[in-house]
């Protein structure tokens, strides 16, 4: 009973233009193009979008007009392939244009770059931004969509429309405020941080679909929606999962118009059926479309129904377990996952999926045994160590976080992960470890019942960043193994890695540890990144360095930066004191 079965349309482009409206249509086409051709200048994209929009309007006027019956992939692909500098700018991606659909679109998708060689976005002065906003609001907002989309080629397009709406609201309000900066900058910081988080979460969904298949994504969705909507019947959850899978498959596949349209339909369905889904949806459903969809996606878990019976009755004690499993394996496992998840909002989704996998493996083995019931009778006992492992890990790491604070906790993780996978590039190790370290301030403040879903599901998102960055330039078999063997066991796989004894320490290069006065003008965050980069390089030079040795060197380094930034002749200080620091550090580490 999917909500997405529609009558066939003569013209798909006209259908989507009418459903979405011109503004959203143009925004989504811009996002799609920027996510595919990440290096193209803004003006080129705007030109392409305008051409597509004009064409769409002719199809709205007459669905039988020439080319209006073509698929969106054909229309968009043809348009992208008109870019004159395709070969020079994108190299082998230009070969995609020699292919036919659907291979051409698959080719474009494979060339999406998670780490494009683009300059860091520098925020101009507030007055400059406000002037640009007032001079041409439409261009200003399009530029925002373009810049985010090209840097985040898997950003969830309908959600990016929501971010753009908030971006516009921030400028509309703050550019009129007495203190523009005080009003605007915190809002922009919040949007930036939320945007990065949103991008990373969506990247995991796309990786799940693309690398592990629809079944893996559906399992994730069953678990998460069952936690969120524990009062909903299994049939209702299954229907939502089917529809949500379609939406994300479309967005991850570059079908952004269909994705946004179907997401709107899904929000509409959910709000029309609140009574059978969740008591927490009322406020969300009173909001406009973009806010409504975002709100539903973030809605808190509903209360669990009272008197839920024991799970064991149907899934362990019942004599019909193997019969039910054999009749419809995925449905039976789906019901198990639904029942387990709705009872355990305190578990991470990945833990629930590990339990379901353990249950499946046990049934596969036991239902072929002489006495199946005897064989699977103790299956729930096998869950205990699987539950305790993340619980203990989170407890230990939250204690460490509370003891060290975020920066030093990040440093501990930097050392830990550099020793595990020293072949990974330093910028990737710094980025990933910093994000791993943020789990402390994000999740350790929560009570026990909320810690695991917060922490472990967040770690899954961050480790996926490592996996997608590493996939672009693979350097470590251990990373490849943890990333590809099992989606739900990625975190335990990385946790279990010990120091890589096969690693040959990096040659010492004094240039890596040479610092200049420009460090003094950096923000606190950027200064931390500089220091953390040095820390990773130290570990790569001396993987067997002890915590104490590394701490001593880092303390000396912090003192050196502080001293030279206070000096009258900063550059001379950095040059002279820097040499001494390098020598002292080499001696301390026995380099």
């Amino acid at each position: 009973r999917g909500v997405f079965r529609r009558d066939a349309h003569k013209s798909e482009v006209a259908h989507r233009f009418k459903d979405l409206g011109e503004e959203n249509f143009k925004a989504l086409v811009l996002i799609a193009f920027a996510q595919y051709l990440q290096q193209c200048p803004f003006e080129d994209h705007v030109k392409l979008v305008n051409e597509v929009t004009e064409f769409a309007k002719t199809c709205v006027a007459d669905e039988s007009a020439e080319n209006c019956d073509k698929s969106l992939h054909t229309l968009f692909g043809d348009k992208l392939c008109t870019v004159a500098t395709l070969r020079e700018t994108y190299g082998e991606m230009a070969d995609c244009c020699a292919k036919q659909e659907p291979e051409r679109n698959e080719c474009f998708l494979q060339h999406k770059d998670d780490n494009p060689n683009l300059p860091r976005l520098v925020r101009p002065e507030v007055d400059v931004m406000c002037t640009a906003f007032h001079d041409n609001e439409e261009t200003f907002l399009k530029k925002y969509l373009y810049e985010i989309a090209r840097r985040h080629p898997y950003f969830y397009a309908p959600e990016l429309l929501f971010f753009a709406k908030r971006y516009k609201a921030a400028f509309t309000e703050c550019c009129q405020a007495a203190d523009k900066a005080a009003c605007l900058l915190p809002k922009l910081d919040e949007l930036r941080d939320e945007g990065k988080a949103s991008s990373a979460k969506q990247r995991l969904k796309c990786a799940s679909l693309q690398k592990f298949g629809e079944r893996a994504f559906k399992a994730w969705a069953v678990a998460r929606l069952s936690q969120r909507f524990p009062k909903a019947e299994f049939a209702e959850v299954s229907k939502l999962v089917t529809d949500l899978t379609k939406v994300h498959t479309e967005c991850c596949h570059g079908d952004l118009l269909e994705c946004a349209d179907d997401r709107a339909d899904l929000a509409k369905y959910i709000c029309e059926n609140q009574d059978s889904i969740s008591s927490k949806l009322k406020e969300c459903c009173e909001k406009p479309l973009l806010e409504k969809s975002h709100c539903i996606a973030e809605v808190e878990n509903d209360e669990m129904p009272a008197d839920l019976p024991s799970l064991a009755a149907d899934f362990v004690e019942s004599k019909d377990v193997c019969k039910n499993y054999a009749e419809a394996k995925d449905v039976f496992l789906g019901m198990f996952l639904y029942e387990y998840a709705r009872r355990h909002p305190d578990y991470s989704v990945v833990l629930l999926l590990r339990l379901a996998k353990t249950y499946e493996t046990t049934l596969e083995k036991c239902c072929a045994a002489a006495d199946p019931h005897e064989c699977y009778a103790k299956v729930f006992d096998e869950f205990k160590p699987l539950v305790e492992e993340p619980q203990n890990l989170i407890k230990q790491n939250c204690e460490l976080f509370e003891q060290l604070g975020e920066y030093k906790f990040q440093n501990a993780l930097l050392v830990r992960y550099t020793k595990k996978v020293p072949q990974v590039s330093t910028p990737t190790l710094v980025e990933v470890s910093r994000n791993l370290g943020k789990v402390g301030s994000k999740c350790c403040k929560h009570p026990e019942a909320k810690r695991m879903p917060c922490a472990e599901d967040y770690l899954s998102v961050v480790l996926n960043q490592l996996c997608v960055l590493h996939e672009k330039t693979p350097v470590s078999d251990r990373v490849t193994k943890c990333c590809t063997e099992s989606l739900v066991n990625r975190r335990p796989c990385f946790s279990a890695l010990e120091v890589d004894e096969t690693y040959v320490p990096k040659e010492f290069n004094a240039e890596t540890f040479t610092f200049h006065a420009d460090i003094c003008t950096l923000s606190e965050k950027e200064r931390q990144i500089k220091k953390q980069t040095a820390l990773v390089e130290l570990v790569k030079h001396k993987p067997k360095a002890t915590k104490e040795q590394l701490k001593a060197v880092m303390d000396d380094f912090a003192a050196f930066v502080e001293k030279c930034c206070k000096a009258d002749d900063k550059e001379t200080c950095f040059a002279e004191e820097g040499k001494k620091l390098v020598a002292a550090s080499q001696a301390a580490l026995g380099l």
Epitope: D307, S310, A313, D314, K319, D320, M335, E339
Partner: antibody, heavy 121, light 110 residues
Framework: EVQLVESGGGRVQPGGSLRLSCAAS????????MGWVRQAPGKGLEYIGI???????YYASWAKGRFTISRDNSKNTLYLQMNSLRAEDTATYFC???????????????WGQGTQVTVSS | IQMTQSPSSLSASVGDRVTITCRSS????????LSWYQQKPGQPPKLLIY???DLASGVPSRFSGSGSGTDFTLTISSLQPEDFATYYC???????????FGGGTKLTVL
């Protein structure tokens, strides 16, 4: 007081449909498997099927396709939907609580008083 | 799956020891998933014995059950006036769809 009360019986024409209800009080309907059993006038007991605590349904081979067991936990009520009724479906229909939760053990330890269904033209 | 009770009817006197047998066409689940019921006219059945030999709550100890696999027995050690009724066996099998009742044994006063 712990009890089961059936309702919804009556006279129906052959080919017609009927939905029987069984209201539980004093306990949660979803805490055990719940079944339906019928008894034709002057005859023995005949098992129809059960619904487990998790909502799995099991039917006697003769009942599959025509009869559907469901439950509404919020109303604490069990249902038996009967379609394509025949003269031979004339009987007293009992709902009953099984000792087990996830399957039918055949041991029903709490019974309703029954509701009479007559199928005739 | 067939559940055959014998005899189909039986006459006895107060104080008598009475035995009713039940045979299934295949083994019941776990070799012991068999129950016995008592039913009086105009009333629903009442569970007496479950799992072949366990006495249900509130049932007098003069009732007992035995047997395993396919052959089972209900024994009333000393018949009381209130025991005159119809008795049914019911078996649970490897699938919950196969639960079945015996045809019944009508116990009357001699």
């Amino acid at each position: 007081e712990v009890q089961l009360v059936e309702s919804g019986g009556g006279r129906v024409q052959p080919g017609g449909s009927l939905r029987l209800s069984c209201a539980a009080s004093g306990f949660s309907l979803s805490s055990n498997a719940m079944g339906w059993v019928r008894q034709a006038p002057g005859k023995g007991l005949e098992y129809i099927g059960i619904i487990s605590v998790g909502g799995f349904t099991y039917y006697a081979s003769w009942a599959k396709g025509r009869f559907t067991i469901s439950r509404d936990n919020s109303k604490n009520t069990l249902y038996l939907q009967m379609n394509s009724l025949r003269a031979e479906d004339t009987a007293t229909y009992f709902c009953a609580r099984d000792r087990h939760g996830g399957d039918s053990s055949g041991a029903f330890y709490l019974w309703g008083q029954g509701t009479q269904v007559t199928v005739s033209s | 799956i067939q559940m055959t009770q014998s005899p189909s009817s039986l006459s006895a006197s107060v104080g008598d020891r009475v035995t009713i047998t039940c045979r299934s066409s295949e083994s019941v689940y776990s070799n012991n998933q068999l129950s016995w019921y008592q039913q009086k006219p105009g009333q629903p059945p009442k569970l007496l014995i479950y799992d072949a030999s366990d006495l249900a709550s509130g049932v007098p100890s003069r009732f007992s059950g035995s047997g395993s696999g396919t052959d089972f027995t209900l024994t009333i050690s000393s018949l009381q006036p209130e025991d005159f009724a119809t008795y049914y066996c019911a078996g649970g099998f490897s699938s919950s769809s196969d639960t079945a009742f015996g045809g019944g044994t009508k116990l009357t006063v001699l």
